[in-house]
């Protein structure tokens, strides 16, 4: 390595190494200054003098110490479906992220590159995953004593009221109807409760009921992709 | 090879003060030089750079309250209006680049103090 | 912005002893690392540059390591001489920069 007040151009110890911020120009056989993020280099090294940088133009940038005659251009806008979530900068590239309500169905080395709306678990099913910002929700089928009344991203199944005189029996989609006295609630067996998503986004598994085996029993089998499973609307 | 700093000295509040750092045993036609303070009993605190190019770069507290510049064998630090948080020692560094990030400083005035008060 | 943030903010340490000053960037900066001691009334001292490498002069006792976000000055079999307080400083960005130091490590050997 070379002693610490070396300035640059300089040529390199038989066997040693430039320092981080250096790199060695072939040319020239010197160590020579990288430019910093933001610039890139105008001017490359000689024998006798030191490279010699320039700020990135619009709508370019670097991101690391660098000796590229070029900055990098920033990626395009953000489509419709997507938030500026890192504006490009001299610095940094533009960062597209899926908005609220949507996934990212193609991930790219930063951001996204291809969204997709959530999907909606219809009524008679609920939400058996939540949706994150890489994964679809999963729709179940809502299991007995447990019921869903709307088309949702995020809603579960919940418990059917507890009657004491009952109007009309609670099935899948609808609660049950109580007639006169106050009803309560039952946590029915299967009545679980998720979070809310942490956003929205990723691969099409859909889930699919399997045929019953047993009274109030089903089981889901993640499919490879295929059309909107039963359970969940289309996008 | 040496750096020394000069201009230190009892100010009162908003007048404008410029400190001089002088090399003497190299040129300053390869390295950059930052200035950098340090308040009685605090830490070191990066004021701002300026390179052989005459570009400048400044921490973003010291924007347009302090200014750097340069001729072949002094760089000048000049406090716009000083206030009494800027009471402190000034030291002038020698950069081993010629860039306006800091890399490392190899060579440090003695410092010159700098005193803000009514 | 490329914040520092040194660890602990004073270190008591008997002679003989290790001492492990730590120095945190809240974003990479690529080993882009510098260490330097100042003693009270005096001018600071480079002893490290690069993360790792000694400035000519500095004993071995001294070393650094670290990478990404996360630095560490260590010092071996610590000597009298070596009561003072330490700093690290970033060469990695000058944009949007409120200091290039870290806050600073007193080191007391008893």
């Known amino acids: 390595l070379p002693a610490q007040v070396a300035f640059t151009p300089y040529a390199p110890e038989p066997g040693g190494t430039c320092r981080l911020r250096e790199y060695y120009d072939q040319t020239a056989q010197m160590c020579c200054s990288k430019c910093p993020p933001g610039q890139h280099a105008k001017v490359f090294c000689t024998k006798t003098s030191d490279t010699v940088c320039d700020s990135c133009e619009d709508s370019t940038y670097t991101q690391l110490w660098n000796w590229v005659p070029e900055c990098l251009s920033c990626g395009s806008r953000c489509s419709s479906d997507q938030v500026e979530t890192q504006a490009c900068t001299r610095e940094q590239n533009r960062i597209c992220t899926c908005r609220p309500g949507w996934y990212c169905a193609l991930s790219k080395q930063e951001g996204c590159r291809l969204c997709a709306q959530l999907r909606k678990c219809r009524p008679g099913f609920g939400v058996a995953r939540p949706g994150t910002e890489t994964s679809d929700v999963v729709c179940k089928p809502c299991a007995p004593g447990t019921f869903s009344n709307t088309t949702s991203s995020t809603d579960i199944c919940r418990p059917h009221q507890i009657c004491h005189v009952v109007a009309i029996p609670g099935n899948a989609s609808m609660d049950a109807v109580c007639t006169s006295t106050s009803p309560t609630r039952s946590m029915a067996p299967g009545a679980v409760h998720l979070p809310q998503p942490v956003s929205t986004r990723s691969q099409h598994t859909q889930p699919t009921p399997a045929p019953s085996t047993a009274p109030g029993t089903s089981f889901l089998l993640p499919v490879g992709p295929s059309p909107p499973a039963e359970g969940s609307t289309g996008d | 090879q040496s750096v020394e700093e000069s201009g230190g000295r009892l100010v009162t509040p908003g007048t404008p003060l410029t400190l001089t750092c002088t090399v003497s045993g190299f040129s300053l036609s390869s390295n950059a030089i930052s200035w950098v303070r340090q308040a009685p009993g605090k830490g070191l605190e990066w004021i701002g750079i300026i390179n052989t190019y005459d570009n400048t770069a400044y921490a973003t507290w010291a924007k347009g309250r302090f200014s750097i510049s340069r001729t072949s064998t002094t760089v000048d630090l000049k406090i716009t209006s000083p206030a009494t948080k800027d009471t402190a020692t000034y030291f002038c560094a020698r950069d081993v680049h010629n860039n306006v990030v800091p890399y490392y400083f190899d060579m440090w005035g003695q410092g010159t103090l700098v005193t803000v008060s009514s | 912005a490329y914040d520092m943030t040194q660890t602990p903010a004073t270190v008591e340490v008997a002679v003989g002893g290790t001492v492990t000053i730590n120095c945190q960037a809240s974003?990479?900066?690529?080993?882009?690392l510098a260490w330097y001691q100042q003693k009270p009334g005096q001018r600071p001292k480079l002893l490290i540059y690069d993360t790792s490498d000694l400035a000519s002069g500095v004993p071995s006792r001294f070393s650094g390591s670290g990478s990404g976000t996360e630095y560490t000055l260590t010092i071996t079999g610590v000597e009298c001489a070596d009561a003072a307080t330490y700093y690290c400083?970033?060469?990695?960005?000058?944009?949007?920069?409120?200091?290039?130091f870290g806050g600073g490590t007193e080191v007391v050997v008893k």
């Open positions: 400083q970033q060469g990695y960005s000058s944009s949007n920069i409120d200091n290039v």
């Open positions: 974003q990479s900066i690529s080993n882009l």
